[in-house]
């Protein structure tokens, strides 16, 4: 029986610059029941807080809500483990929201055929952006990335659509079913998971010649 | 012919874990999303979460948070879920689903009882 | 969380008659729906994606339409096959989510 052995906090993502969660990956257990807390303090300051809610998150979480949240200060935390032979501690670390965000996947990818008459046919696709992420304040910019493939593909085709929730593909294969994912990035930041995947069915007739 | 073969029938008892496997044939597991869903018994469909075998990423339902792990082992086509920390309320069918939702394995009973 | 809500829970017919199944969606889903079939024993089968697309041999009988948050799988007559469990399922965002299922139960 020993000292639990030392935590590590591995992550720390927001969804919208208003809210946050850090995660911690707990040391050895040392053979004895463990508990963990998490303390912070914001930087200038000398008072230590714990974890407002150890819940929302899920298993070694901390989940910091609007009210504990603030974009324009830097959070400096540790996790310290203890059981009945002793304590551990996390490095200290220091944690800006505003290069932490981490969007929700885009929303209501739409795929359609497009045939005009006078012009080559082409994949029209379109999305909306996360509905927690605020455009119209200003504070985001959104960047966007589609991915596509034929069904049994193991290779996906990428393309950057910039600001752009709309994006046109010429060349696809006819009769073929295309998977269709979007994802998104604020200037600061990290990619979102991946939209669950839209399908279509490009019908035979689909052409590709001028 | 796109096929998912899932392991046998389990019974366990509660606190324990299950692994249920999903071979692929037809496909490969690289191209190939998987979902899995679950379904007690005389209930509905619920999902629990997504593995996506090209980037190792996984998305799961909020309610298993912690206790669902999802993987794949390209080279025998093959997709894992496993639950852990069992309760009698997990006893249903688990399903292992193409990404497409029009392959879908033939079912997993997984019993939790004491 | 979208919830999805299916409407009736069973709908009695007659073989040979028309039957309207109703999924309604808490947000707007745009048209990432699809509606399936489950019969005792089995797995579920797709019939319908893309709110309004029928699966790979799936018959004509089967249509949907919808768009946003109101959705209808009519099947236009009734086969002694038909009579089974129908689920939609969203796959807008994550999580996705079934409907409670309506059973089409012989009249």
């Known amino acids: 029986q020993l000292p639990p052995g030392k935590p590590e906090i591995f992550k720390c993502r927001s969804p919208n610059k208003e809210t946050f969660t850090c995660w911690w990956r707990p040391g050895t257990d040392g053979g004895l029941p463990t508990n963990y807390s998490l303390t912070y303090h914001r930087e200038g300051e000398t008072l230590m807080h714990e974890c407002p809610d150890y819940i929302t998150g899920g298993p070694n979480s901390c989940h910091f809500g609007k009210q504990y949240t603030s974009m324009w200060r830097t959070y400096i935390m540790m996790v310290n483990a203890t059981n009945q032979m002793g304590s551990s501690f996390s490095d200290e670390l220091y944690v800006d929201v505003t290069y932490i965000v981490q969007p929700d996947p885009p929303l209501e990818l739409a795929v359609e055929v497009k045939q005009p008459e006078d012009r080559k046919p082409y994949l029209w696709i379109k999305w909306s952006p996360p509905t927690l992420i605020d455009l119209k304040t200003g504070w985001f910019t959104l960047l966007y990335e589609i991915r596509l493939k034929p069904e049994k593909a193991a290779e996906w085709e990428i393309h950057f659509a910039g600001q752009q929730t709309e994006f046109k593909i010429l060349s696809l294969h006819p009769g073929q079913k295309y998977l269709v994912q979007v994802r998104c990035k604020p200037d600061h930041g990290y990619w979102s998971a991946w939209s669950p995947a839209t399908f279509i069915q490009i019908p035979s007739d689909f052409t590709m010649n001028d | 012919q796109v096929q998912l073969v899932q392991s046998g029938a389990e019974v366990q008892k509660p606190g324990a874990s299950v692994k249920v496997s999903c071979k692929v044939s037809?496909?490969?597991?690289?191209?190939?999303?998987i979902h899995w869903v679950r379904q007690a018994p005389g209930k509905g469909l619920e999902w629990m979460g997504n593995f996506d075998p090209g980037d190792g990423e996984t998305i799961h339902a909020q309610k298993f948070q912690g206790r669902v792990t999802m993987t794949g082992d390209t080279s025998t086509d093959t997709a894992y879920m496993e639950l852990s920390s069992l309760r009698s309320e997990d006893t249903a069918v688990y399903y292992c689903v193409g990404v497409t939702f029009d392959y879908w394995g033939q079912g997993t009973l997984v019993t939790v009882s004491s | 969380e979208i919830v999805m809500t299916q409407s009736p829970a069973t709908l009695s017919v007659s073989p040979g008659e028309r039957a309207t199944l109703s999924c309604r969606a808490s947000?707007?889903?745009?048209?990432?729906l699809a509606w399936y079939q489950q019969k005792p024993g089995q797995a579920p089968r797709l019939l319908l994606y893309?709110?309004?697309t029928r699966a790979t041999g799936i018959p004509a009988r089967f249509s949907g339409s919808g768009s946003g948050t109101e959705f209808t799988l009519t099947i236009s007559s009734l086969q002694s096959e038909d009579f089974a469990l129908y689920y939609c399922q969203h796959y807008n965002n994550w999580p996705l989510t079934f409907g409670g299922g309506t059973k089409v139960e012989i009249k």
């Open positions: 947000q707007s889903v745009a048209s990432n």
């Open positions: 893309g709110a309004s």
């Open positions: 037809g496909y490969t597991l690289t191209a190939l999303s």
